[in-house]
């Protein structure tokens, strides 16, 4: 059990295109065919104007036209919905496929890819129907761009909705050594962070988020996964103690603003018969800004690296109310391997601490839209979009 840890199955609320919680000013496009197919007409199920956003330029062969939605705060986007231009039966234009790009800071844009590295998403087959796409992995984003595609020169139009919830953790990125491959007699277990959206260099992943922040906790047997058609070890990121003569794996965590940290929760594997052990201990240090020094003595929490119950579990590391925007934690080896599937934080925003990304305020002047009070995880009065077996989601 991961208290305070978000449940992706419950993070599926409409984020405000259809119900206009997202104002017109937060929807922008690369170009529009006409004012009647401008950005503001891109709302799911809307029949305003000529019934959708339609770009001025062709989307074949170049895929450069986009529709951008600014969510104003970091959200976990778990699902998107698309429609074409129906316009009371007069519209014929829709997009059979599209790509997504997203940004947390308005400066660096990432391509959304599925768990097998595919960027292209199947879209609509007709102008009127809504097609929902489950995003596996989900994306943590403030800004989302839809890039419609076509396989020939043709008109495409788009209406959209995004579904998810506020990203309460406030985690902007984590830095960690690259996950490694475990050689078992019968199989190679790939313990890499396969959805990491930052950079990789010199054995280090930095500047992004990935499987350790996607809400998916691993199974007791790390060779198995809750996901379909993935490789052994998929749910876990793991490191061999043979690669770390220091005896620990060091990670850094960067947050959106100054926070008071209560607890860090780390979901770990403990299948010690195959070498995976809980950490022997955790040491964390804090700092308030990127150029500042790490403050004082680290918070130390001994764990003992249990050899008993081999089930995977969440360990809670008390962080003692320390204040910071950056954490550096060392996870001590108690056995041959450390395997983590999820890391989350329970923290409170320090009052009057302004957001770090982007430099402009998250919210326009005036009060934030009431649907997204910082105290709420989901918009009021809504039900999340269900994720059914063989559901209408792609």
């Amino acid at each position: 059990d991961m208290k305070g840890h978000f449940d992706p199955a419950k993070c599926r609320y409409a984020l405000g295109m259809q119900d206009r919680t997202i104002p017109d000013s937060d929807i922008s496009v690369s170009s529009s065919w006409s004012d009647s197919t401008a950005a503001r007409h891109s709302r799911l199920e809307s029949s305003d104007g000529d019934g959708a956003w339609c770009p001025a330029g062709p989307v074949f062969p170049k895929e450069e036209e986009y529709l951008q939605v600014d969510l104003r705060r970091l959200h976990l986007v778990a699902l998107v919905g698309t429609q074409g231009r129906h316009a009371g039966g007069l519209g014929k234009e829709f997009s059979r496929s599209y790509r997504l790009r997203y940004s947390r800071d308005g400066r660096r844009w990432m391509d959304w890819k599925d768990r097998w590295g595919q960027e292209v998403i199947s879209g609509n087959e007709d102008p009127g129907g809504v097609v929902l796409k489950d995003l596996g992995p989900p994306m943590v984003a403030r800004l989302v761009r839809f890039y419609p595609r076509a396989d020939r020169v043709m008109s495409v139009c788009l209406r959209v909705e995004l579904y998810g919830c506020l990203w309460r953790d406030g985690l902007l990125s984590y830095t960690a050594p690259v996950g490694q491959t475990m050689q078992l007699s019968e199989v190679m277990v790939h313990l890499n962070d396969s959805t990491y959206d930052g950079y990789t260099a010199g054995g280090l992943q930095y500047g992004g988020l990935g499987q350790l922040a996607d809400g998916v906790v691993g199974l007791d047997d790390f060779r198995q996964s809750q996901e379909l058609r993935v490789w052994p070890g998929y749910d876990y990121v793991g490191w061999s103690n043979q690669s770390f003569p220091t005896g620990y794996v060091e990670m850094e965590f960067e947050f959106d603003r100054l926070r008071t940290f209560q607890t860090m929760q780390v979901h770990c594997n403990n299948m010690h018969t195959l070498g995976a052990r809980l950490p022997g201990g955790v040491e964390c240090r804090f700092k308030r800004g990127p150029a500042m020094a790490w403050e004082g003595e680290p918070v130390r929490h001994a764990l003992g690296g249990s050899l008993g119950d081999p089930r995977a579990r969440a360990i809670s590391v008390p962080l003692g109310g320390h204040v910071g925007r950056f954490l550096q934690c060392r996870f001590l080896f108690a056995g041959p391997w450390l395997l983590f599937s999820e890391i989350s934080f329970i923290s409170d925003v320090v009052n009057d601490s302004s957001d770090t990304f982007p430099p402009a305020p998250w919210w326009p002047p005036g009060p934030p839209p009431t649907n997204f009070s910082s105290l709420e995880l989901e918009p009021r009065g809504q039900q999340p979009v269900a994720k059914a077996e063989g559901s209408p989601t792609a």
Partner: antibody, heavy 118, light 107 residues
Amino acid sequence: QSLEESGGRLVTPGTPLTLTCTASGFSLNRYYMLWVRQAPGEGLEWIGTISYGDTTYYASWAKGRFTISKTSTTVDLKMTSPTTEDTATYFCARADTGDNGYLGLQLWGPGTLVTVSS
Amino acid sequence: ELVMTQTPASVEAAVGGTVTIKCQASQSIGSVLAWYQQKPGQRPKLLISGVFDLASGVPSRFKGSGSGTEFTLTISDLECADAATYYCQYIPYGSSPFGGGTEVVVK
């Protein structure tokens, strides 16, 4: 992306010498950087490593004899008091991970020759 | 301090043949092992990391195996261009000793 060593020359025993490795096309701040040497006709010998966090590691025989430091574009190897046994070609190399997450020295400089002789 | 021991120091084989080079670690190093090729007057070239993983552009004639303390580099279908000295290295995030090297002579 490339590495180039410089500073190698003929020195007399006991004369301190600093070798510099200059990186082009990337920042050293994100890599483990190693110094390796090779005496004439001999094998490769690891001297030391500096991490992206500026932690240094040395071979037991090299402690006290060599000091490694770096900036964002250069890594220095200081030979505190060279002896004739330190005559060798000195390489700097960059560690990177392969697909399976394990390190290897994927980028090497051409080397610089240090001759210690009286 | 961990020591890497390579055998043999030199091996000779004919074009088209197979060569096996062994590397032994003085204590278990899991899969934290790389192999390099060095030709006279040149800088070393990475062949394999993590025991098995071929570096970019390295032909599949090169094969790494082993775990723990015993490792092997096998070169099959030997070509004249494979004449070189081969080194193993324990390369964690820290200390990184090399083996003594094995010279491969191709007849």
